[in-house]
Interface confidence: low
């Protein structure tokens, strides 16, 4: 016997209460693909989480994160603070990066300062908080009557929104 | 949120190979963003990070064998002169300290 | 060079049963606990579980426990599914950008 509940559309589920009748999805639920016995309830974006893109009833409600907080994960599944480029979130809040090392976001953790030594070159540009050094050529490139590097334009500043 | 890759193809060996990283639903340029191959029937291998302001990192077999540039909309892998033993699925991945989204994966085969 | 070696290639237990995966670095990751890990299952991509060592991440379910620091690392998964049949990927990261994946643990439910 062919199963009714597959000429259900997007929208709607399949009610076995009314003989396999198609019912619209009832409000602040979804679905998304035909065929469904129940409706989904509708993602709700509250607290450090804001609305995207509303709920239909054929697609889940999509959120971002309030200003001071940046997604995490395939969905915007979870909201993690902001720092300023220069620090680290830690256990116990935003704190400042240690001399020799850099973040250039306001997420992640800061990271040593590359080694231009290990590679044979020689320090452009001093690193900061914020900033990897630039390495540029090495000492025996820069003796007299060698071309002179041209420094590199400067790096361009990531996005200052946090998505 | 999303990311796709692009670009993968059979290529001979030798000829460059450029691929590309896009990402929906939120801005790539905020992001570190790293790629990731797979051989067939294989585990995960690194290749490389780029940070958000442009600087690349390599791992170190990856060195001269691959360049990682980006865009303010794309991240690019371009895989410089391949050979068989580059025949893989390529990932690109979201994020420094754990990759929480990654696209789907772009087939690159390389064969004469 | 770093190296991440997960000693076994594959483990089974039955449903409702308990597996460990261990993961150990031959130098110390950054921070100490600059490790994640990651499932795949065949045809898909790596979904990430863990990071900083230990760490949940959003929407894993808390049968995944990651626990560890420095160079010995262990990912611990209870009351298995049979959707937990996967393979399970440590990666470590090391100064300088290092990053590293070990090898992979196949996941057998019974």
């Known amino acids: 016997l062919q199963d009714l509940c597959s000429n259900c559309p997007a929208g709607t589920f399949c009610d076995n209460n009314r003989s396999q009748i198609c019912s619209p999805c009832p409000p602040n639920s979804f679905s998304s693909a035909g065929g469904q016995r129940t409706c989904d309830i509708c993602r709700q974006c509250k607290g450090v989480f804001k609305t995207r893109k509303e709920c239909s009833s054929t697609s889940n409600a999509e959120c971002d994160c309030i200003s001071g907080y940046h997604c995490l994960g395939a969905e915007c599944s979870m909201c993690e603070q902001d720092c300023k480029q220069g620090q680290e979130l830690t256990k116990k809040g935003c704190k400042d990066c240690c001399f020799g090392t850099f973040n250039d976001q306001k997420r992640g953790i800061c990271r040593p300062w590359t080694n231009c030594s290990l590679d044979g070159k020689s320090v452009l540009v001093n690193g900061t908080k914020e900033r990897d050094v630039v390495c540029g050529p090495s000492p025996a490139d820069l003796s007299p009557g060698a071309s002179s590097a041209t420094p590199p334009a400067p790096a361009r500043e990531p996005g200052h929104s946090p998505q | 949120q999303s990311l796709e890759e692009s670009g993968g193809r059979l290529v001979t060996p030798g000829t460059p190979l450029t691929l590309t990283c896009t990402a929906s639903?939120?801005?790539?340029?905020?992001?570190?963003m790293n790629w990731v191959r797979q051989a067939p029937g294989k585990g995960l291998e690194y290749i490389g990070i780029i940070s958000s302001s442009g600087s690349a990192y390599y791992a170190s077999w990856a060195k001269g064998r691959f360049t990682i540039s980006r865009t303010s909309t794309t991240v690019d892998l371009r895989i410089t002169s391949p050979t068989t033993e580059d025949t893989a699925t390529y990932f690109c991945?979201?994020?420094?300290?754990?990759?929480?989204?990654w696209g789907q994966g772009t087939l690159v085969t390389v064969s004469s | 060079a770093q190296v991440l070696t997960q000693t076994a290639s594959s483990v089974s237990a039955p449903v409702g049963g308990t597996v460990t995966i261990s993961c150990q670095s031959s130098?110390?990751?950054?921070?100490?606990?600059?490790l994640s890990w990651y499932q795949q299952k065949p045809g898909q991509r790596p979904k990430l579980l863990i990071y900083?060592?230990?760490t949940l991440a959003f929407g894993v379910p808390s049968r995944f426990k990651g626990s560890g620091s420095g160079t010995e690392f262990t990912l611990t998964i209870s009351d298995l599914e049979c959707d937990d049949a996967a393979t399970y990927f440590c990666q470590g990261g090391y100064s300088g950008w290092i990053y590293v994946f070990g090898g992979g643990t196949e996941v057998e439910v019974k």
């Open positions: 991945a979201r994020g420094d300290y754990g990759m929480d989204l």
């Open positions: 639903g939120f801005s790539l340029s905020n992001y570190y």
């Open positions: 900083y060592a230990s």
């Open positions: 130098q110390t990751v950054y921070n100490n606990n600059l």
